[in-house]
C-alpha cells in the first residue's frame, strides 16, 4: 500500500490556445486530469489501472502551481494504491480548458483539451522527487513525482505491513525495511522477551520485564545465584538448593546439634581446659586451686590438709605454708626429729621404732590418721565418690554431690536416660556414659527418631533434557532446574517461537 504523488509546478500556454490551435475566450481556464496505470511500452488509452485524479481550475494560460493549492485542490496530487508497487508505471497528464464551472468529462466539449503528455518508466519507492518537463509546440509543463509507502507499510515495494507496538505482544518500532527494531530492554523475534538484569543467572533466574531478576524455586539473591538451604537449616550452608551442609562443630539434619559446646559456649571458668565429649556434653579440667563441674569454685589449698604431723596450714597468695610443731620440719612437716621415747603418737596411737631408733611410725586407732595420729580421718581423702562426684565433709559423716546423670550414696548409680522413653516412633533406647542413643526404625532419623526420613523424589529421574533434580525434603517432592532452552515442571518442553513472519 502506498501513494504515487504528482507535484505540478508550472504550466506555460503563452498564446492561450487549445490543442486545436483555437484560442480560449477570454483565456484558457486550466485544470488537469491525471491517469496512472501499469507500464506500457507505448502508452495507450484505456483503464487507469493504478488510479485517476482531477484538479480544480489552477490558473489561466500560464501560471505557477503553489503547494497544496487552495480551492479544494491538493498539490502534490495523491494517487493511492493498495497493492505491491511494481516499480514501473505509465502516466498521462491532460490539461483542459473549463468554459464553465462543471469539470466533469461529459460536460466538456472534446476540443476543450489544451495538451496531453504521456510518460512511462521505472520508479523505485523513495522520498526523492523526480523532476520532469514536457514541452509541446504550444505548451510546457514542469512537474515532479515520487512513490512513497502508506503509513505502516515498508520495504522496496510497500508490501511489508508493520505497526509499532509496546504491549505484551511486542515492544518495537519499525525499520525502513519493515523489520522490527526492539525497544530498549527487549529482545527476541517479536521483541517480546525482556532482557533481564545484567548478571542474572541464566538458568536460575528469569524476568518478566527488563532489568528484573526473578528467582526460580530454590534460588535467591539479587542475581539468583545463591541457593536456598533446606527449610530449618540452622548452622549450615548449601551449594545446590535444599541442602544443609553443616558448619564446623554442628551436626544433624538441620545442623542444629551442637558438636562443639566448648567453642560455642565456653562453659569452663577460671582458665580451665574444655574438652567436647559428645552432643552438648563437655568436661572441664580445672587449674590448681579450682573445682566444680565448670571449675567455678575456688579451692583453698589448705583444704587438702597438706601439713603433716600436726602442722598448721596458712593460705598464701601463691600457695600455702606449713607451721610445724616442735620436733618436725620440712615443707609439709614430714620430717621428724623425735623417737618413740618422746611419745610422739597422739590419740592412743602406738609407737614403733624404725632404723635402729633413728625414727618411728605411729599405728593409729580407728578414726585417726597422720604420721602422729594427730588428725581425725577425712572421709573424703579416699575419693569415695564415683563418676566425678564431689565429696563434702559434713562433721563426722561425708556426702557425695553427684554430677548430672549419676545418683546413689557414692554416685555409683547411672541414672537411666532411657527411663522416660525419649525415642520417638518406636526407636530403641541405649544408655551411654554421656547420655543416650536412639536406634531408629526404617523411615525415621534424628537424635530422637523424630525426623521422618524423606523419600528421594529424584530417585525416579523425573526431570528431562539433562535438567538437575532437587528433592524438597519438606514436602517429599522434586524440583527440576531446567537447562537453557527448556521449560515445564519436568523441563519436558523446548522453548521456541514460530520461526518467522507469515508475510
Amino acid at each position: 500500500s502506498g501513494v504515487f504523488q504528482l507535484q505540478l509546478q508550472e504550466f506555460i500556454n503563452e498564446r492561450g490556445v487549445l490543442a486545436s490551435g483555437r484560442p480560449c475566450e477570454p483565456g484558457c481556464r486550466t485544470f488537469f486530469r491525471v491517469c496512472l496505470k501499469h507500464f506500457q511500452a507505448v502508452v495507450s488509452p484505456g483503464p487507469c489501472t493504478f488510479g485517476t485524479v482531477s484538479t480544480p481550475v489552477l490558473g489561466t494560460n500560464s501560471f505557477a502551481v503553489r503547494d497544496d493549492s487552495s480551492g479544494g485542490g491538493r498539490n502534490p496530487l495523491q494517487l493511492p494504491f493498495n497493492f505491491t508497487w511494481p516499480g514501473t508505471f505509465s502516466l498521462i497528464i491532460e490539461a483542459w480548458h473549463a468554459p464553465g464551472d462543471d469539470l466533469r468529462p461529459e460536460a466538456l466539449p472534446p476540443d476543450a483539451l489544451i495538451s496531453k503528455i504521456a510518460i512511462q518508466g521505472s520508479l523505485a519507492v523513495g522520498q526523492n522527487w523526480l523532476l520532469d518537463e514536457q514541452t509541446s509546440t504550444l505548451t510546457r509543463l514542469r512537474y515532479s513525482y515520487r512513490v512513497i509507502c502508506s503509513d505502516n507499510y515498508y520495504g522496496d515495494n510497500c508490501s511489508r505491513l508493520c505497526k509499532k507496538r509496546n504491549d505484551h505482544f511486542g515492544h518495537y518500532v519499525c525499520q525502513p525495511d519493515g523489520n522490527l527494531s526492539c525497544l530498549p530492554g527487549w529482545t527476541g523475534e517479536y521483541c517480546q522477551q525482556p532482557i533481564c538484569l545484567s548478571g542474572c543467572h541464566e538458568q536460575n533466574g528469569y524476568c518478566s520485564k527488563p532489568a528484573e531478576c526473578l528467582c526460580r524455586p530454590g534460588w535467591q539473591g539479587r542475581l539468583c545465584n545463591e541457593c536456598i538451604p533446606h527449610n530449618g537449616c540452622r548452622h549450615g550452608t548449601c551449594s545446590t538448593p535444599w541442602q544443609c551442609t553443616c558448619d564446623e562443630g554442628w551436626g544433624g539434619l538441620f545442623c542444629d546439634q551442637d558438636l562443639n559446646y566448648c567453642t560455642h559456649h565456653s562453659p569452663c571458668k577460671n582458665g580451665a581446659t574444655c574438652s567436647n565429649s559428645g552432643q552438648r556434653s563437655y568436661t572441664c579440667t580445672c587449674r590448681p586451686g579450682y573445682t566444680g563441674v565448670d571449675c567455678e569454685l575456688e579451692l583453698s589449698e589448705c583444704d587438702s590438709n597438706p601439713c603433716r604431723n600436726g602442722g598448721s596450714c596458712k593460705d598464701q597468695e601463691d600457695g600455702y605454708h606449713c607451721l610445724c610443731p616442735p620436733g618436725y620440719y620440712g615443707l609439709h612437716c614430714e620430717h621428724s626429729t623425735l623417737s618413740c621415747a618422746d611419745s610422739p603418737c597422739f590419740n592412743g596411737g602406738s609407737c614403733r621404732e624404725r632404723n635402729q631408733g633413728a625414727n618411728y611410725a605411729c599405728e593409729c586407732p580407728p578414726n585417726f590418721t597422720g604420721s602422729n595420729c594427730e588428725k581425725k580421718v577425712d572421709r573424703c581423702t579416699s575419693n569415695p565418690c564415683a563418676n566425678g562426684g564431689q565429696c563434702l565433709n559434713r562433721g563426722p559423716s561425708r556426702m557425695c554431690r553427684c554430677r548430672p546423670g549419676f545418683t546413689g550414696t557414692y554416685c555409683e548409680l547411672h541414672v537411666s536416660d532411657c527411663a522416660r522413653n525419649p525415642c520417638a516412633h518406636g526407636g530403641t533406647c541405649h544408655d551411654l556414659e554421656n547420655g543416650l542413643m536412639c536406634t531408629c526404625p526404617a523411615g525415621f532419623s534424628g537424635r530422637r527418631c523424630e525426623v521422618r526420613t524423606s523419600i528421594d523424589a529424584c530417585a525416579s529421574s523425573p526431570c528431562f533434557n539433562r535438567a538437575t533434580c532437587y528433592t524438597d525434603l519438606s514436602t517429599d517432592t522434586f524440583v527440576c532446574n531446567c537447562p537453557y532452552g527448556f521449560v515445564g515442571s519436568r523441563c519436558e518442553f523446548p522453548v521456541g517461537l514460530p520461526p518467522s513472519f507469515p508475510w
Epitope: D151, N152, L161, K163, K164, R165, N166, D167, H168, F169, G170, Y190, Q192, Q193, Y206, S208, V487, G488, E492, F493, V495, G496, L497, P498, F501, P502
Partner: antibody
C-alpha cells in the same frame, strides 16, 4: 491441534467468587509465543476481554475488572484459571478461554467451547 | 477507555459483497482481528493483523485498516456466512472488542 476446555461451577451466589479452570490438551501451556486468555459474553450481548497470562505468570487484566480478577497458571497440570470475586448478576455470561498468538498480532486462534456461569441466589 | 464501534447489522444478498466497518480513534495504527460467531458456537478467527487470513478461512474474507476505520469484506457472500462478526484490537495491554455486527 491444541484444544481448550473450561470447567467450573455453573451457578455462583452473589458476592461470592467465581472460579473457572481451562485445561489445555494437544500442546504445552509453556510454549513461548502464546498468551492464555479469558473472554466472556453475557447472554445476547457482545464479547468482553477479561485478561490473559503468560506461562511465566505475567498477567494482564481489563482495567474495568482489575480489582476483582485473578488469573493464574499451573504449568505442571497444563491449566490456567480465572477467579472473579464479589460477583453480581451482571457477571452472568458464557466464559471462554482462548489462546492468543504473538505471531498473529495477538489474535485468538483457538477457543474453548465456553461455559455458562449464572450468578443467582 | 478505548472503544470500537460497529454497525449493529448488515444485510446482503447471496453472491453479493458485504462490508462491515469497525471505527476507533487512530485504529489504522493498531492491528485488527476479526471473529465470526455463529449461534451457540465459540468465536472463530477469520482475519488477523488487518488483512491476513488464518489457514482454512476462505479467500472471500478480506480485511483492510487505515485512518480510523477497519473493514471486513465478504465477497460472494454465502448463506453459511450468516453470523455475528466482532472486530478486536489491543489498546496498550488491554484487549478491546467491537460491539458486534449481525450479518444476514
Amino acid at each position: 491441534e491444541v484444544q481448550l476446555q473450561e470447567s467450573g461451577p455453573g451457578l455462583v451466589k452473589p458476592s461470592e467468587t467465581l472460579s473457572l479452570t481451562c485445561t489445555v490438551s494437544g500442546g504445552s501451556i509453556s510454549s513461548s509465543g502464546y498468551y492464555w486468555g479469558w473472554i466472556r459474553q453475557p447472554p445476547g450481548k457482545g464479547l468482553e476481554w477479561i485478561g490473559d497470562i503468560y506461562y511465566t505468570g505475567n498477567t494482564y487484566y481489563n482495567p474495568s475488572l482489575k480489582n476483582r480478577v485473578t488469573i493464574s497458571v499451573d504449568t505442571s497440570k497444563n491449566q490456567f484459571s480465572l477467579k472473579l470475586s464479589s460477583v453480581t448478576a451482571a457477571d452472568t455470561a458464557v466464559y471462554y478461554c482462548a489462546r492468543e498468538e504473538v505471531i498473529l498480532g495477538g489474535g485468538a486462534d483457538q477457543w474453548g467451547q465456553g461455559t455458562l456461569v449464572t450468578v443467582s441466589s | 477507555s478505548y472503544e470500537l464501534t460497529q454497525p449493529p447489522s448488515v444485510s446482503v444478498s447471496p453472491g453479493q459483497t458485504a462490508s462491515i466497518t469497525c471505527s476507533g480513534e487512530s485504529l489504522g495504527d493498531k492491528y485488527v482481528s476479526w471473529y465470526q460467531q455463529k449461534p451457540g458456537q465459540s468465536p472463530v478467527l477469520v482475519i488477523y493483523e488487518d488483512s491476513k487470513r488464518p489457514s482454512g478461512i476462505p479467500e472471500r474474507f478480506s480485511g483492510s485498516n487505515s485512518g480510523d476505520t477497519a473493514t471486513l469484506t465478504i465477497s460472494g457472500t454465502q448463506a453459511m456466512d450468516e453470523a455475528d462478526y466482532y472486530c478486536q484490537a489491543w489498546d496498550g495491554e488491554t484487549g478491546v472488542f467491537g460491539s458486534g455486527t449481525k450479518v444476514t
